[in-house]
């Protein structure tokens, strides 16, 4: 689809006369009608098959044809064609005189003919004019003409539509060949697929606009190539979305159980060596002058009882000091200066002599120490509960208060989930990490073996001889209903034939 | 040959939600080359474009509709649905579900054979 | 809002041309699309882009479209087109529909 457009510009006819030679009264009254047809060799009339247009008068015998585009859009003359633009034509052009206003081909003398031109040739689409001139005996017309396409049609002849949009079915505009041309940040054969923001993962994400990226379910971050763990996933990560695949030191579905207590709290104090014991359980092994369950208790260094045979301990910046008792000396009391005769043992204890009576040595009753049995026995020094128990001194003995999940004399042993016996019915008990599984008899199930579940004794197929089996469901045994003939339990006698039995 | 087919529930409460499926087949919903839409129609009266989907999930609607409506895709069913809330007597109407095409210039070659939704207590 | 105006019913003769108009503030710069609705029946596409015509069409079916105004137009009617005819454009991202034009086969 285009327009042919004519632009007369000056028209001559210096003696004011038609072509018959006869003179226009007052003067010639100059329009003009234009044909425009396909290409002939030789321009013959017919029909205008590419369209005609007429003017109004324009002028009197000689004037210059004043572009009007503007106005009313008389000039240049517009052709329109809705075919494809062949690249060639013809066009005749006729100029009349009009003695009235009714300018009708009909209403008109045949003599009222000025001057005909016809031309023909090739002619390609484009903003160009042609500029032509063609000049009769006693007549010039001076014009220019072209062949441009209608709006939104585009091409070498015109053929091509396109027109610009910005809307979901496309962004672009139309480049003069008719082909499209994308808007910045979209692409596709028709514009209508926006580029993601650059790095936006391929299959996680997406874009309704430029520069956008929109994750897909399960994925997440700027360029949508981070997974989503699974919801409540606390120490985990995952590779693909909804995974909880646990940080080391973890475990658990949500990876939430803490297998790694040392690590991740450092419970132990001043120096102490942490040991993890189970989930969520630490032994802490305290360096020398420290004490607790998280060895938090800085130890006197009297606490030891370095000094013997009844010296007081008195503590000091660098250490200690002991102070003896009358009898003894050294840096721990341990030299006597006594003998038996003295009574040195305390508490019961029985003296022996040594070295020819120039020393001694107590023997102590129970639940006392030292070297004159003075002190009484703590049986708690040596920290001997494991897993964090508590030592209690009981007279004679001692006992240690175990955290929970731990028993034993010294607490060393975790709480078995299977101690209790959970498992009805037989069940077989497995500890587990986090809990307990039970196995369950033939016949039963459920968490701890707690549901009844008849067993098909018909199953193993026990009846012979084609008889009937029936399931017992109160004792879980069979029973067959035997066939005419045959006798059994299990219907595996014919009649007649005694059973031959082995005694 | 493309086939779409609506479903949903023919009555519907004034001030409730109405909600239809449109179920694709002979085609894949996630080619680039179509949109999804629906189009409705009062009983006696002409076509109403009430919006459409791309397979990505990017939305369009009617900005006379706009707040009330919701169109939703779910590609591996090869399904597109509508939900228009607040719905009222002049929301009757035959609901079209159509395929709209880029290269048609968005013209909508295949559609649905409507269902029928009547807005009554 | 974007609208586009029909005439609502059209009337021809078997054998003779129907010519059923649709405008639109600049409508030749939008692809207009033509749909034949009859009866108790789904809406069919007849045209689009203006004035191509779908595979099935009858080629009695012709469309052009410029300035403010697109027309669809049936030459050589048969009673089988008595229908109704919508045009349709898109304004931005909104598909508008014509009011719709009957037409009746005498």
């Known amino acids: 689809s285009g327009v042919f457009q004519l632009q007369l510009q000056e028209f001559i006819n210096e003696r004011g006369v038609l072509a018959s030679g006869r003179p226009c009264e007052p003067g010639c009254r100059t329009f003009f009608r234009v044909c425009l047809k396909h290409f002939q060799a030789v321009v013959s009339p017919g029909p205008c098959t590419f369209g005609t247009v007429s003017t109004p008068v324009l002028g009197t015998n000689s004037f210059a044809v004043r572009d009007d585009s503007s106005g009313g859009g008389r000039n240049p003359l517009q052709l329109p064609f809705n075919f494809t633009w062949p690249g060639t034509f013809s066009l005749i052009i006729e100029a009349w005189h009009a003695p009235g206003d009714d300018l009708r081909p009909e209403a008109l003398p045949p003599d009222a003919l000025i001057s005909k031109i016809a031309i023909q040739g090739s002619l390609a689409v484009g903003q160009n004019w042609l500029l032509d001139e063609q000049t009769s005996t006693l007549t010039r017309l001076r014009y220019s003409y072209r062949v441009i396409c209608s709006d939104n049609y585009y091409g070498d002849n015109c053929s091509r539509l396109c027109k610009k949009r910005n809307d979901h079915f496309g962004h672009y505009v139309c480049q003069p060949d008719g082909n499209l041309s994308c808007l910045p940040g979209w692409t596709g054969e028709y514009c209508q697929q926006p580029i993601c923001l650059s790095g936006c993962h391929e299959q996680n994400g997406y874009c309704s606009k430029p520069a956008e990226c929109l994750c897909r379910p399960g994925w997440q971050g700027r360029l949508c190539n981070e997974c989503i763990p699974h919801n409540g996933c606390r120490h985990g990560t995952c590779s693909t979305p909804w995974q909880c695949t646990c940080d080391e030191g973890w475990g658990g579905l949500f990876c939430d159980q803490d297998l790694n207590y040392c690590t991740h709290h450092s419970p132990c104090k001043n120096g102490a060596t942490c040991s993890n014991s189970g989930q969520r359980s630490y032994t802490c092994t305290c360096r020398p002058g420290y004490t607790g369950v998280d060895c938090e208790l800085e130890l006197s260094e009297c606490d030891s009882n370095p000094c013997r045979n009844g010296g007081s301990c008195k503590d000091q910046e660098d250490g200690y000091h002991c102070l003896c008792p009358p009898g003894y000396y050294g840096l721990h009391c341990e030299h006597s200066t006594l003998s038996c005769a003295d009574s040195p043992c305390f508490n019961g204890g029985s003296c022996r002599e040594r070295n020819q009576g120039a020393n001694y040595a107590c023997e102590c009753p129970p639940n006392f120490t030292g070297s004159n049995c003075e002190k009484k026995v703590d049986r708690c020094t040596s920290n001997p509960c494991a897993n964090g128990g508590q030592c209690l001194n009981r007279g004679p003995s001692r006992m240690c208060r175990c955290r929970p999940g731990f028993t034993g004399t010294y607490c060393e042993l975790h709480v078995s989930d299977c101690a209790r016996n959970p498992c009805a019915h037989g069940g077989t008990c497995h500890d587990l990490e986090n809990g307990l599984m039970c196995t369950c008899p033939a016949g039963f199930s459920g968490r701890r073996c707690e549901v009844r579940t008849s067993i098909d004794a018909c199953a193993s197929s026990p009846c012979f001889n084609r008889a009937t089996c029936y399931t017992d469901l109160s004792t879980d045994t069979f029973v067959c209903n035997c066939p005419y003939g045959f006798v059994g339990s299990r219907c595996e006698f014919p009649v007649g034939l005694p059973p031959s039995f082995p005694w | 040959e493309v086939q779409l087919q609506e479903s949903g529930p023919g009555l519907v409460k004034p001030s409730e939600t109405l909600s239809l499926t449109c179920t694709v087949s002979g085609g894949s919903i996630r080619n680039s080359r179509y949109h999804w839409g629906w189009i409705r129609q009062p009983p006696g009266k002409g076509l109403e474009w009430i919006g459409d989907?791309?397979?990505?999930?990017?939305?369009y609607y009617n900005p006379s509709l706009k707040g009330r409506v919701t169109i939703s895709v779910d590609t591996s069913k090869n399904q597109f649905s509508l939900k228009l809330s607040s719905v009222t007597a002049a929301d009757t109407a035959v609901y079209y579900c159509?395929?709209?095409?880029?290269?048609?210039?968005?013209?909508?070659?295949?559609w649905g054979q409507g269902t029928l939704v009547t807005v009554s207590s | 809002s974007y609208e586009l105006t029909q005439p609502p019913s059209v009337s021809v003769s078997p054998g003779q041309t129907a010519s059923i108009t649709c405008s639109g503030q600049r409508l030749g710069d939008k692809y207009a699309s033509w749909y034949q609705q009859k009866p108790g029946q789904s809406p069919v596409l007849v045209i689009y882009?203006?004035?191509k015509r779908p595979s099935g069409i009858p080629e009695r079916f012709s469309g052009s479209n410029s300035g403010d105004t697109a027309t669809l137009t049936i030459s050589g009617t048969q009673p089988m087109d008595e229908a109704d005819y919508y045009c349709q454009a898109w304004d931005r991202d909104t598909g508008v529909f014509g009011y719709g034009t009957k037409v009746t086969v005498l």
């Open positions: 989907i791309y397979y990505t999930g990017s939305t």
């Open positions: 159509a395929r709209e095409d880029v290269i048609l210039r968005g013209g909508s070659d295949y």
């Open positions: 882009e203006d004035s």
